[in-house]
């Protein structure tokens, strides 16, 4: 038969013949010949290959460096890389999660719209009229102004986006 010019999906062409690629989790030791199949070897501890391949070296698992605020979210296998995430209170700086930064706090006058996760930062929003935030926080939402009326009190000092209203007693009518 004529030598092939193309091979099947999990094969590669070498020396005018199609050889089987190595399966995920294994690296290439030697190409196939007319008399032997492709020889592959499992990746070592802390190594992986995640595709059918002809690599002669496995990739090292990612190291989740605690000095960068990282921890292991999912341990790597011979077929998958380690997945890192950030310590509590921190989030990844990129999709690859190579380092972490502290969650942002929302300044007074702003409240938390969305609490941060391991991969996304805090989202803040300005407190609208009728709401306030007097603290810098990564968790607190804007609080509604106190309703003086429901306490049979009157507004003595108007609220702002950073302060609550101040309620006081109603002026008594004198006889």
């Amino acid at each position: 038969p004529e030598p092939p010019t193309a091979c099947r999906e999990k094969q590669y062409l070498i020396n005018s013949q199609c050889c089987s690629l190595c399966q995920p989790g294994q690296k290439l030791v030697s190409d196939c010949t007319e008399f032997t199949e492709t020889e592959c070897l499992p990746c070592g501890e802390s190594e992986f290959l995640d595709t059918w391949n002809r690599e002669t070296h496995c990739h090292q698992h990612k190291y989740c460096d605690p000095n960068l605020g990282l921890r292991v979210q999912q341990k790597g296998t011979s077929e998958t890389d380690t997945i890192c995430t950030c310590e509590e209170g921190w989030h990844c700086t990129s999709e690859a999660c190579e380092s972490c930064v502290l969650h942002r706090s929302c300044s007074p006058g702003f409240g938390v719209k969305q609490i941060a996760t391991g991969v996304s930062d805090t989202i803040c929003e300005p407190c609208p009229v009728g709401f306030f935030s007097n603290v810098s926080s990564a968790f607190e939402k804007c609080h509604p102004w106190t309703s003086c009326e429901t306490k049979d009190l009157v507004v003595q000092q108007a609220g702002t986006n950073k302060t609550d209203v101040v309620c006081g007693p109603q002026d008594r009518l004198r006889a």
Partner: antibody
Framework: EVQLVESGGGLVQPGGSLRLSCAAS????????MNWVRQAPGKGLEWVSI????????YYADSVKGRFTISRDNSKNTLYLQMNSLRGEDTAVYYC???????????????WGQGTLVTVSS | DIQMTQSPSSLSASVGDRVTITCRAS??????LNWYQQKPGKAPKLLIY???SLQSGVPSRFSGSGSGTDFTLTISSLQPEDFATYYC??????????FGQGTRLEIK
């Protein structure tokens, strides 16, 4: 004449183990990959595992990975399937099938054994 | 993994009829498609490999065609011994090796 003869089937309880054998003759056994294919009662064909001819590289269907082990003894012209942690859904006729190539990248199965029935039930 | 879908799942025909069974792959498999015949209580038997090549000893009334994703098995003139279940199988992206769900050919 190519012949494949399976043996080792039978009734086993869930969680139990069984070892199937396939005795081959009529061809150069080590030159070809070998497969196990199963067929549940009244159902279609399901490929289970493959082992390459010389080196003995293996690959498994997800449904049996970690529970079944395929192996071969080229000096005895025999293929094996060690089945552990058996479940009800493993009940089937198990066929050994000869590949037309040496490696595990799969090709037509030109010869099949007659099959051996494995029943997993308490 | 590549999925193989056969149609119809069952078919009634008479001796002498021309019958066509189709097989569709979920992605292109070039011409790496095989057909098997299985009779009740028996092992499958290879009929056609590489989409259109007739396996040695198989009668010439069986033929296969197609490439890419769509394939057909044709029996030009049904004989009594052809009533069986037919399976397609891809061998392009393997392992895993995947079969169609089968087409049962019955006597009308």
């Amino acid at each position: 004449e190519v012949q494949l003869v399976e043996s080792g089937g039978g009734l086993v309880q869930p969680g139990g183990s069984l070892r199937l054998s396939c005795a081959a003759s009529g061809f150069t056994f080590s030159s070809y990959a070998m497969n196990w294919v199963r067929q549940a009662p009244g159902k279609g064909l399901e490929w289970v595992s493959i082992i390459s001819g010389t080196i003995g590289k293996t690959y498994y269907a997800d449904s049996v990975k970690g529970r079944f082990t395929i192996s071969r003894d080229n000096s005895k012209n025999t293929l094996y399937l060690q089945m552990n942690s058996l479940r009800g859904e493993d009940t089937a006729v198990y066929y050994c099938a000869k590949d037309t190539e040496r490696d595990i990248t799969g090709s037509p199965f030109d010869y099949w054994g007659q099959g051996t029935l494995v029943t997993v039930s308490s | 993994d590549i999925q193989m879908t056969q149609s119809p799942s069952s078919l009634s025909a008479s001796v002498g009829d021309r019958v066509t069974i189709t097989c569709r792959a979920s992605q292109s498999i070039s011409s790496y498609l095989n057909w098997y015949q299985q009779k009740p209580g028996k092992a499958p038997k290879l009929l056609i490999y590489a989409a259109s090549s007739l396996q040695s000893g198989v009668p010439s009334r069986f033929s296969g065609s197609g490439s890419g994703t769509d394939f057909t098995l044709t029996i030009s003139s049904l004989q009594p011994e052809d009533f069986a279940t037919y399976y397609c199988q891809q061998s392009y992206s393997t392992p895993p090796i995947t079969f169609g769900q089968g087409t049962r050919l019955e006597i009308k």
